[in-house]
Interface confidence: medium
């Protein structure tokens, strides 16, 4: 059946060091555990975290990310995921993608990353 | 079955506090995040506080904002507002609300609880 | 704030009628739009989620439309149980946001 995918309408933001959730959803919500799931960075594909078979596939990411991802699927169940970045890095900001694949059929969504700088003040003087 | 249950609604005198609970069964409650919505006698609803499935991030109107804490003890599966600084405009039903997503990304509810008066008078 | 404006603010119907309420917003909201019921003393009910996903367990005669500012709830044919209020609720950006409500009456 089709659907379509709901990633945040706004940036994400996030402190250098610390963790970003990027959400993602499928509506109507339906189980996607047995779906394609992931996430890649725009423009230039290249995977930041891939989910198939019931299973994340380590080995498909891109070096920069490998360890620092976890997908959460609590409610995949209802078509709900959210990626979860480890120790953001100023190199993290920008544009990613998520998809969702169902056989033949895939939809994505696009969604903005803001890394800030925890230690960044401006003198008031 | 998702269930939710506010507890904690009374009479109230102006500049005094409450503080509400919302006991969640039937889902992960620690998965999802929670909302309260208000509303007055014979009024419209009204968004009231969000706070995501972890308890880090918060929003509130900014009708109340100052005055009203939202809060949640995942370990006991509740969902708590504080009241304080009650004034005669605070008088609704409170309704807990189960947020469709875990964090807060746009918030809508697919499950209410039945809800608790909260009167505010002198 | 974005300001959610239903119309019309109530309506007389008749059972098997085709009703239509529509909710327009201060400005754009995408598809960010839910559909609530609500019936006397009752906590609201979620209808349709994202502008136009039933939710589940909700009966398909009921259907959402629209995308960016105007959106519509149909009810194809109205049944005894679906005399009650209905609500739009924007979720694009904080603080969301409620229409004022629909009370739809017996004719």
């Known amino acids: 059946g089709q659907f379509r995918v709901i990633g945040p309408g706004y940036p994400i933001r996030a402190l250098v060091g610390d963790e970003a959730e990027l959400p993602c959803r499928i509506s109507p919500g339906k189980n996607a555990t047995g779906m394609e799931v992931g996430w890649y960075r725009s423009p230039f594909s290249r995977v930041v975290h891939l989910y198939r078979n019931g299973k994340d596939q380590d080995a498909e990411q891109a070096p920069e990310y490998r360890g620092r991802t976890e997908l959460l699927k609590e409610t995949i169940s209802e078509g709900k995921v959210t990626l979860r970045i480890q120790n953001v890095r100023f190199s993290d900001e920008g544009g990613y993608t998520c998809f969702f694949r169902d056989h033949s059929y895939q939809e994505e969504a696009a969604m903005e990353l803001k890394v800030e700088d925890p230690f960044y003040w401006v003198n008031p003087g | 079955e998702v269930q939710l249950v506010e507890t904690g609604g009374g009479l109230v005198q102006p500049g005094g506090s409450l503080r509400l609970s919302c006991a969640a069964s039937g889902f992960t409650f620690s998965s999802y995040a929670m909302s309260w919505v208000r509303q007055a006698p014979g009024k419209g609803l009204e968004w009231v506080s969000d706070?995501?499935?972890?308890?880090?991030?918060?929003y509130y109107a900014d009708s109340v904002k100052g005055r009203f804490t939202i809060s949640r003890d995942n370990s006991k599966h509740t969902l708590y507002l504080q009241m304080n600084s009650l004034r005669a405009e605070d008088t609704a039903v409170y309704y807990c609300a189960k947020d469709y997503y875990d964090i807060l990304t746009g918030s809508f509810f697919d499950y209410w609880g039945q809800g608790t008066l909260v009167t505010v008078s002198s | 704030d974005i300001v959610m404006t239903q119309s019309p603010s109530s309506l007389s119907a008749s059972v098997g009628d085709r009703v239509t309420i529509t909710c327009r917003a201060s400005?754009?909201?995408?598809?960010?739009l839910a559909w609530y019921q609500q019936k006397p003393g009752k906590a609201p009910k979620l209808l349709i989620y994202d502008a136009s996903s039933l939710e589940s367990g909700v009966p398909s005669r009921f259907s959402g439309s629209g995308s960016g500012t105007d959106f519509t709830l149909t009810i194809s044919s109205l049944q005894p149980e679906d005399f009650a209020t209905y609500y739009c609720?924007?979720?694009?950006?904080?603080?969301?946001?409620f229409g004022q409500g629909t009370k739809v009456e017996i004719k």
């Open positions: 400005q754009g909201i995408s598809s960010a």
């Open positions: 609720q924007q979720f694009n950006s904080y603080p969301w946001t």
């Open positions: 706070i995501n499935h972890s308890g880090g991030s918060t």
